[in-house]
């Protein structure tokens, strides 16, 4: 998991990190839910979209996101997040050609259609947290995480190490 003592040091390292190549080391389809087991769902049209955080009906299938895992070149000083001491970054795609993006100016999580290579705003550092949860830290704005605010996804600034385990930035990945 993300080390409690290393917030500032890790933040500096993130600024300098770059992604090895343009191909993911692995890809994984998973449903995304909050710490409180609400589902993340996507209502996407060509010109508009909504990202919901909601309780799903019992008979409804959960939306899935395609998580593409990338290895960053910068070695991680923290344990648990990387492969061979390197950080793992992910992109998240709910459907073909669309990816979650961090809009740091608006503190929002957006869906954008784009071609590869993807912009840095589409990359998130993956942190394995407690209770089989993960969190997603913006590559472009270290210390800022995808979180839940008012039943929507938003970018949330985590300014102290104690807040790294706050429930609103914790997510669960499931194959079902």
């Amino acid at each position: 998991a993300f080390g409690i003592s290393g917030v500032q040091k890790y933040t500096r390292a993130l600024h300098d990190s770059s992604i090895t190549g343009i191909s993911p080391i692995t890809e994984y389809l998973a449903s995304l839910s909050t710490y409180n087991d609400q589902s993340i769902t996507f209502a996407l049209e060509d010109e508009s979209y909504e990202i919901y955080v909601e309780d799903l009906k019992k008979d409804e299938k959960k939306d899935k996101v395609l998580l593409s895992y990338y290895e960053s070149q910068h070695p991680s000083n923290e344990s648990g997040d990387g492969v061979d001491g390197k950080m793992l970054m992910v992109t998240l795609s709910p459907t073909k050609d669309f990816w979650l993006h961090a809009n740091n100016k608006e503190h929002s999580v957006e869906l954008h259609k784009c071609e590869k290579p993807l912009p840095d705003q589409a990359f998130f550092v993956l942190h394995n947290m407690h209770s089989n949860c993960v969190s997603f830290e913006c590559k472009t704005d270290p210390g800022v995480f995808i979180g839940v605010k008012d039943n929507h996804l938003a970018l949330i600034k985590v300014d102290s190490s104690e807040n790294l385990c706050t429930e609103n930035i914790l997510f669960k990945l499931s194959e079902t």
Epitope: L29, S31, F42, A43, L44, E45, D46, K57, K58, D59, E60, K61, K62, D63, K64, V65, L66, S93, P94, T95, K96, D97, F98
Partner: antibody, heavy 126, light 106 residues
Framework: EVQLLESGGGLVQPGGSLRLSCAAS????????MSWVRRAPGKGLEWVSA????????YYADSVKGRFTISRDNSKNTLYLQMNSLRAEDTAVYYC???????????????????WGQGTMVTVSS | SYVLTQPPSVSVSPGQTASITCSGE??????AAWYQQKPGQSPVLVIY???KRPSGIPERFSGSNSGNTATLTISGTQAIDEADYYC?????????FGGGTKVTVL
């Protein structure tokens, strides 16, 4: 603007065949599941068939299974319904409909029908 | 096969409230959609995911769904609301429509 334009309807004898087409425009055709829905004279709406955005998955109502084939040509932005062994009870206005939202990776039929064509009449009679 | 049951007809005076029910086994465990169809026209989606209204659909249209019944409510019904209304759910990768309800504005 989303537009769906059906064609190919007409009068056909029982046991005959017909191919319906639905020309789509105004959206990324290959990203959406598409369906055929019909309404027989004096009756209600009946879902007939659906196809995934890639064309890799197809779904049919029991009433048409084995007789109708749904397909799509994403390069032409066109949806098709090949109807064989037609019966009198297949007489209806046939609508093509687009899912409200783009397909998610999980696939399957999940979303409401957000956009409809104007329909094409199929009459099966001797 | 899954069956959705609607009343064949509902009559309402202008300005009054019309309620159309749609019954099915464990209906509340599924998302219900509602479509309006006027004579000679194509169906139009008026409610999806039980309660949500597509853009362009007036606020007088609302929906609910729990138990075994979904309900479409038209508040302050107007003459232009006279039409056939259909509920619909997805079940086992098929679309299932109710039989339809003809709403007459007296």
């Amino acid at each position: 603007e989303v537009q769906l334009l059906e064609s190919g309807g007409g009068l056909v004898q029982p046991g005959g065949s017909l191919r319906l087409s639905c020309a789509a425009s105004g959206f990324t055709f290959s990203s959406y599941a598409m369906s055929w829905v019909r309404r027989a004279p004096g009756k209600g709406l009946e879902w007939v068939s659906a196809i995934s955005g890639s064309g890799g998955s197809t779904y049919y109502a029991d009433s048409v299974k084995g007789r109708f084939t749904i397909s799509r040509d994403n390069s032409k932005n066109t949806l098709y319904l090949q109807m064989n062994s037609l019966r009198a009870e297949d007489t209806a206005v046939y609508y093509c409909a687009r899912d409200l939202w783009m397909e998610n990776w999980v696939g399957g039929l999940r979303y409401p029908f957000g956009y409809w064509g104007q329909g094409t009449m199929v009459t099966v009679s001797s | 096969s899954y069956v959705l049951t609607q009343p064949p007809s509902v009559s309402v005076s202008p300005g009054q409230t019309a309620s159309i029910t749609c019954s099915g086994e464990r209906m509340g465990d599924k998302y219900a959609a509602w479509y309006q169809q006027k004579p000679g026209q194509s169906p139009v989606l008026v409610i999806y995911q039980d309660t949500k209204r597509p853009s362009g659909i007036p606020e007088r249209f609302s929906g609910s769904n729990s138990g075994n019944t979904a309900t479409l409510t038209i508040s302050g019904t107007q003459a232009i609301d006279e039409a056939d209304y259909y509920c619909e759910v997805k079940k086992s990768d098929t679309g299932v429509f109710g039989g339809g309800t003809k709403v007459t504005v007296l």
